[in-house]
C-alpha cells in the first residue's frame, strides 16, 4: 500500500486560502534549532518560525536521520566533546547534510579528567 507522505497542510496562516503548501523547516544557522518554513498558496507566500530538533537521533520522524559514531574525548580547552553523524535516511524533499558534527558539554567528571590530563602536559 502506498504511503502518503510529504502532504501539504490545509489552513495555516491566512487560512482564507484553501490549501497551503509548506516547504521543509530550514534552520537559520547550522543544522538545527530555530528557523523558517516557507509556504505558498496561489500567489500568496508566508514564512513561519519553526524548529529543527538538535537531538536528531531520538527525534521521531525528523527530516534527516543520522547514524552517529561514539563521542570523542573531552576537549579540556572548550569543555566540549564532538561526534560525527553520517546521513542514514532523508525525507524525500529534505536537503540534508551528508555528514554533521554534534557538540555537547562534557560532564563535570570528564571535564575534570581532561583538565588533569592537560595539566600533566599530555595530548
Amino acid at each position: 500500500v502506498a504511503k502518503k507522505k510529504d502532504k501539504v497542510k490545509k489552513g495555516g496562516p491566512g487560512s482564507e486560502c484553501a490549501e497551503w503548501a509548506w516547504g521543509p523547516c530550514t534552520p537559520s544557522s547550522k543544522d538545527c534549532g530555530v528557523g523558517f518554513r516557507e509556504g505558498t498558496c496561489g500567489a500568496q507566500t508566508q514564512r513561519i518560525r519553526c524548529r529543527v530538533p538538535c537531538n536528531w537521533k531520538k527525534e521521531f520522524g525528523a527530516d534527516c536521520k543520522y547514524k552517529f559514531e561514539n563521542w570523542g574525548a573531552c576537549d579540556g580547552g572548550t569543555g566540549t566533546k564532538v561526534r560525527q553523524g553520517t546521513l542514514k535516511k532523508a525525507r524525500y524533499n529534505a536537503q540534508c547534510q551528508e555528514t554533521i558534527r554534534v557538540t555537547k558539554p562534557c560532564t563535570p567528571k570528564t571535564k575534570a579528567k581532561a583538565k588533569a590530563k592537560k595539566g600533566k602536559g599530555k595530548d
Partner: antibody
Framework: QVQLQQPGAELVRPGHSVKLSCKAS????????MNWVRQRPGQGLEWIGM????????ILNQKFKDKATLTVDISSNTAYMQLSSPTSEDSAVYFC??????????WGQGTTLTVSS | EIVLTQSPATLSLSPGERATLSCRAS??????LHWYQQKPGQAPRLLIK???QSISGIPARFSGSGPGTDFTLTISSVEPEDFAVYYC?????????FGGGTKLEIK
C-alpha cells in the same frame, strides 16, 4: 558520485516474471531513495515507485501495485524491480535513479525490456 | 494525482535564441518541481531542482522559476547541444508525476 549500472537489455516471455537490476557503486547507496521510471517507445516518463535501502521503505505508484515489486540487497549495493506477468504493454526502457534532495540525482542508462514469445 | 501540463509541445528555435518552457501544475506544489533534459537513447539529466536551484555541472544558461503552480525553464541562449526533450517532474506528493515533455527542435 554514484554510478548506477543496469543491463542493456532483457528478453522475457509473456507471463514469465522478470527481475531487473540496478547496481550502485561510488558514494553510499544506502542513504538515498532509489526511484524506478518507465519509458515506453516514443513516450514520456512514468514513475513506478521508490525504495529506501536503509529500511526498505517502499512507496509505489498505485498504477503499478500489482505489477512491480521493489527490493534491495545492501550487501551487493543492488536494487531490484520484479515485474509480474509481463505483457507486450510492459515492453519499455526501465531506468533506476538515486535521489538526494541536496545534490540531485544519478541515473542508470536504462534496461530495454522486450516482452515477446 | 498532480497533473503537470507542459507547453508548448514543440518549440522551434535557432541557436542563440532564448527558450522559455512552461510547466503548470494542477494544484500548488510549493517549489517541489524539477526539470530534466533527455536526448534520444540516453537517460534523463537533471537541470534544475526545487524550481530554481542549480545543479553542479549544468551550464549557467539554464535557469528556473516558481513556486506555486506555474513554473518556467529558461535557456538564455540556446546552444546546438540543447536540442532535446525537456520534462518537468513534481515531488510534492505521491505518486511523483512528470509532464508530457517539450521538444526543443532546430528551426
Amino acid at each position: 558520485q554514484v554510478q548506477l549500472q543496469q543491463p542493456g537489455a532483457e528478453l522475457v516471455r509473456p507471463g514469465h516474471s522478470v527481475k531487473l537490476s540496478c547496481k550502485a557503486s561510488g558514494q553510499s547507496f544506502s542513504s538515498y531513495w532509489m526511484n524506478w521510471v518507465r519509458q515506453r517507445p516514443g513516450q514520456g516518463l512514468e514513475w513506478i515507485g521508490m525504495i529506501h535501502p536503509s529500511d526498505s521503505e517502499t512507496i509505489l505508484n498505485q498504477k503499478f501495485k500489482d505489477k512491480a515489486t521493489l527490493t534491495v540487497d545492501i550487501s551487493s549495493n543492488t536494487a531490484y524491480m520484479q515485474l509480474s506477468s509481463p505483457t507486450s504493454e510492459d515492453s519499455a526502457v526501465y531506468f533506476c535513479s538515486s535521489w538526494s534532495a541536496k545534490r540531485g540525482d544519478f541515473w542508470g542508462q536504462g534496461t530495454t525490456l522486450t516482452v515477446s514469445s | 494525482e498532480i497533473v503537470l501540463t507542459q507547453s508548448p509541445a514543440t518549440l522551434s528555435l535557432s541557436p542563440g535564441e532564448r527558450a522559455t518552457l512552461s510547466c503548470r501544475a494542477s494544484e500548488s506544489i510549493s517549489n517541489n518541481l524539477h526539470w530534466y533534459q533527455q536526448k534520444p537513447g540516453q537517460a534523463p539529466r537533471l537541470l534544475i531542482k526545487y524550481a530554481s536551484q542549480s545543479i553542479s555541472g549544468i551550464p549557467a544558461r539554464f535557469s528556473g522559476s516558481g513556486p506555486g503552480t506555474d513554473f518556467t525553464l529558461t535557456i538564455s541562449s540556446v546552444e546546438p547541444e540543447d536540442f532535446a526533450v525537456y520534462y518537468c517532474q513534481q515531488s510534492n506528493s505521491w505518486p511523483l508525476t512528470f509532464g508530457g515533455g517539450t521538444k526543443l527542435e532546430i528551426k
